[in-house]
């Protein structure tokens, strides 16, 4: 129950905190669980205990194992276990799952990526940051204290981010790296009754007989990702697919756009080779979501060809 997994790379510093906390004044004893051998507190040792911290400076693969810490409070000896695994350094760029810290999510307004475990170390700024093993460059990236700030976050910013810093212990420097995944999520959105931006209600659209015509139904539904939101066209109150006129088709798929942060959808109705009978039809742009349905009606009228000679 009071057990914690810790991991690191060989030849890097690794500092582990006892899973049992306590007042700073409490004595903490560390043992190597398999042998019950006490971990020394003298800093000249490569592996030594320092209060609630167990330090590997630097770590070796052979250090892997379970370590016991006992926090001696005035009333009880409280026991915790640190399960430490030290891995060999990978030659390629890929960071395996077992070396990854918890995934963090960011959005356009909040894009901080904290360097995991850094608070355990004696480090000085700046941190070095890498994404998918490439050093981050450019004004969009700012290393600030123990975190990375990304300006104008985009979905392409998702990926694995590695922070690299130097731990200093009594004048000796040790490298530390830590990697975590970053995902980009939409800002907290909201949903509202559909608002049709086009066409206007009872709009008259001029078309030329024999030519092609496009009608666009465009509506907004709120902010952020929307569920069960759709726009579509009807002819005389009938779905396009059921109307049975092959010249009149809805554009496959709905285009999602974000206008001023709003989530909007549009659907294009394409009429090929406009005929006289098309002018008699009622064209309904429908926008619907969980709040309800809004309908704007369009009619077609004949557009007189412009006489360029007059």
């Amino acid at each position: 129950k009071f057990s914690k997994q810790s991991w690191g790379l060989e030849n890097e510093a690794l500092i582990v905190r006892c899973p049992r906390q306590g007042k700073p004044s409490y004595t903490v004893d560390w043992y190597y669980s398999q042998t019950n051998k006490s971990i020394p507190t003298q800093e000249r040792n490569r592996v030594f205990a320092s209060g609630q911290l167990l330090k590997f400076l630097p770590a070796a693969v052979a250090d892997s194992g379970i370590y016991t810490c006992i926090v001696r409070s005035p009333t009880f000896n409280r026991t915790g276990y640190a399960n430490v695994t030290i891995y060999k350094k990978q030659s390629d760029c890929n960071v395996p799952d077992y070396l990854m810290y918890s995934t963090v999510s960011g959005s356009e307004k909040n894009s901080k990526i904290y360097c995991p475990t850094i608070d355990l170390y004696n480090w000085t700024a700046p941190l070095e940051w890498f994404k998918n093993c490439q050093a981050l460059q450019g004004s969009r990236y700012r290393a600030h204290k123990s975190f990375l700030v990304i300006d104008n976050v985009m979905t392409e910013d998702a990926g694995d981010y590695t922070c690299k810093f130097i731990h200093n212990e009594n004048g000796a420097n040790y490298s530390v790296t830590a990697t975590r995944s970053f995902t980009v999520k939409d800002e907290q959105g909201f949903s509202l009754f559909p608002v049709i931006g086009a066409p206007a209600q009872n709009e008259i659209k001029e078309v030329e007989i024999g030519k092609n015509a496009n009608l666009t139904c465009s509506a907004c539904f709120g902010k952020g990702t929307q569920f069960l939101a759709a726009v579509l066209w009807q002819l005389n109150g009938t779905k396009i697919t059921d109307f049975g006129e092959p010249r009149i088709q809805q554009e496959e798929g709905q285009n999602q756009s974000f206008s001023n942060g709003l989530a909007c959808l549009d659907m294009v109705l394409r009429i090929a080779d406009v005929k006289e009978e098309d002018l008699l039809l009622q064209y309904d742009c429908l926008a619907l979501n969980l709040h309800g349905l809004r309908r704007h009606t369009v009619r077609l009228s004949r557009k007189n060809p412009i006489d360029h000679h007059s």
Epitope: K1, K23, S25, S73, P74, F76
Partner: antibody, heavy 121, light 106 residues
Amino acid sequence: QVQLQQSGAELVRPGASVTLSCKASGYTFTDSEMYWVRLTPVHGLEWIGAIDPETGDTAFNQKFKGKATLTADKSSSTAYMELRSLTSEDSVVYYCTRAFDNDNDDGFAYWGQGTLVTVSA
Amino acid sequence: QIVMTQSPAIMSASPGEKVTMTCSASSSVNYMHWYQQKSGTSPKRWIYDTSKLASGVPARFSGSGSGTSYSLTISSMEAEDAATYYCQQWSSNPLTFGAGTKLELK
């Protein structure tokens, strides 16, 4: 939310024993040590002892070492304190209590409502 | 064991008055906790780790001190503050409380 529900008032004969209970809810019983404190007119609050429900380990105020026995039943999330060889001086209110953050011993943040023990012939 | 001595044992204060009560430990302690108890009710954690206010405690309360000398202060007494206040150390076994300071409304 964390709640500690103590058993009702007890009237016992001098020299007899009594067992008080404290049922915990709203948290994982084995994650926090349970402490017992009493309130006396003369000394005010006095710490009696404590038990770690996970291990059964106990810690006592030496003054109460022969007087109190602490146990815990993990299955019912209940801590018990048996008081024996009762005298009139044991006629006080007994509380079970626990810290807010067990490991940091940051004061007794949660208290039972108290059990009044009356020792009388 | 560490003996905690609270003073005064009883005190009274008028509304708006500043109140200070002290707790002296027979040996040095690292932290002090304070509890408020009103008649017929369980104690309440009031100040912990010397100076941190427990949840719901008004900001007019404060705690300070180190070593063997600690105090609880109310910047402006209010009627609801009338109660008995106990200090407690958690630095050595046995855990010990002071005998309490009874604060009355004048």
